[in-house]
């Protein structure tokens, strides 16, 4: 087997494993939120992991480019131009996956839990646009509703408090996830910051995919062992 | 706003039970523990403990255990603190406060709840 | 369980004056102190939490500062509904315990 199928099947494992925990990580909220929805308690933790980021984004797409890079591994049918270039072409997919993974994500870590913006964990703060990406800016990426103490006023009314220094709230020992507010501050910012990582990787490794995969149209791949014979 | 509404003043006999209650609106009542706080006249402040009220979890001050039980009623936004066995020394103006961020400092309070042990 | 020792436990001051009250720790509580307000026969109000952020609504007049074991609340230009009795109080650890309280009087 050529560097380049190595390379592929590495690939294809890695992608396997990056899927397994997108796929993983968006349940987690989702999972809390059908728990914890008894008769007077619809408190959803926030509402981009209903956009799927880790299902959808980071998992299905994913799934072409998977199956074609670990097929490589068994030289079967993918073991030849024709794979490694649908390889590649499937990875276009797992890099859109990917990227969308990545933007529902930020926008996540933006804004916080629901309860950090709506006193009643409405879903009013929980559209998705590509304007709110674009109004990014580095100073807006604070995570001030985690790293203070509160995230925001219960009443949603007054400003957050944005005199509370950063990172007051873990500048000591002393931080408790008794309250169901710091249950959904921790839960929300492990799974978001978690699926941007997944986001990152994947990008990272389907990018390398269709840059093998093309180097692989190009110089040939291994011929079969019966061949060889 | 958040607001905590406690019950009236409470006059009671020495051995007696009594239960007082702490009704919370302007915030998402399970979001958040309530803290109960003793003053005893012209004294100080002892903090007697917790409920989670989205799971009933407790948290008490070792001082108060087989004192004081909290409870809570999600449907009506009511916590309640219940003192047994009441004697003189649990004279004193009982508050409810809303606990809040990583610390569960006291962020908002009730306006308290008198109770007089008396014979 | 921690000792919050206060001082004073009392002072008379004049409108418009600066004062600082001061807490301390029987160990260090890495800055999880607040500070609370208690109007007289009204109940509490939190003015100052994690030893150096105000809470909503506080006038810029209060601040706190202090680490380790040692803080201390100070009020620049006295107004007269500042008149009351302060608690410091730590969220270190539990139990949570409070100072033993300054009553603020006018001179």
């Known amino acids: 087997m050529t560097c380049c199928e190595g390379w592929t099947s590495c690939n294809g494992f890695s992608l396997l494993v990056l899927l397994l925990l997108g796929v993983v990580l968006n349940a987690i909220p989702l999972i809390v939120s059908l728990v914890e929805e008894d008769q007077f308690s619809q408190n959803p933790i926030s509402c981009f992991e209903w956009w799927f980021p880790g299902i959808i984004g980071a998992g299905l797409m994913a799934i072409p480019a998977t199956t074609m890079s670990l097929t490589a591994r068994k030289r079967a049918c993918c073991n030849n131009r024709t794979g490694m270039f649908l390889s590649s072409l499937f990875s276009v997919i797992t890099v859109i996956g990917a990227l969308y993974c990545m933007l529902i994500s930020i926008q996540a870590l933006l804004k916080g839990p629901l309860m950090c913006n709506s006193p009643s964990n409405s879903n009013a703060n929980c559209e998705f646009s590509l304007k709110n990406i674009s109004d990014i800016h580095p100073e807006s990426f604070n995570l001030q509703w985690f790293f203070n103490d509160s995230c925001a006023p219960p009443t949603g009314f007054n400003k957050p408090t944005s005199n509370d220094t950063m990172a007051s709230g873990w500048r000591a020992s002393s931080f408790h996830f008794d309250s169901e507010e710091n249950k959904h501050r921790l839960i929300h910012f492990s799974v978001f910051l978690g699926l941007l990582l997944v986001g990152i990787l994947e990008v990272l490794f389907g990018l390398s995919q269709i840059v093998i995969g093309f180097l692989g149209c190009l110089c040939g791949v291994s011929k079969r062992r019966s061949q060889i014979v | 706003e958040v607001q905590l509404q406690q019950s009236g003043p409470e006059l009671v006999k020495p051995g007696a039970s009594v239960k007082m209650s702490c009704k919370a609106s302007?915030?998402?009542?399970?979001?958040?523990?309530m803290h109960w706080v003793k003053q005893k006249p012209g004294q100080g402040l002892e903090w007697i403990g917790y409920i989670n009220p989205y799971n009933a979890g407790t948290k008490y001050n070792e001082k108060f255990k087989g004192k004081a039980t909290l409870t809570s009623d999600k449907s009506s936004s009511t916590a309640y603190m219940e003192l047994s066995s009441l004697t003189s020394e649990d004279s004193a103006v009982y508050y409810c406060?809303?606990?809040?961020?990583?610390?569960?400092?006291?962020?908002?309070w009730g306006q308290g709840t008198l109770v007089t042990v008396s014979a | 369980d921690i000792l919050m020792t206060q001082s004073p436990s009392s002072m008379s001051v004049s409108l418009g004056d600066t004062v600082s009250i001061t807490c301390h720790a029987s160990?260090?509580?890495?800055?999880?102190i607040g500070w609370l307000q208690q109007k007289p026969g009204k109940s509490f109000k939190g003015l100052i939490y994690l030893a150096t952020n105000l809470e909503d609504g506080v006038p810029s007049r209060f601040s706190g500062s202090g680490s380790g074991a040692d803080y201390s609340l100070t009020i620049t230009s006295l107004e007269s509904e500042d008149f009351a009795v302060y608690y410091c109080?730590?969220?270190?650890?539990?139990?949570?315990?409070f100072g033993g309280g300054t009553k603020l009087e006018i001179k």
């Open positions: 109080v730590q969220y270190s650890q539990f139990p949570r315990t």
């Open positions: 160990q260090g509580i890495s800055s999880n």
């Open positions: 302007g915030y998402r009542f399970t979001n958040y523990v």
């Open positions: 406060a809303r606990g809040a961020g990583w610390s569960l400092r006291f962020a908002d």
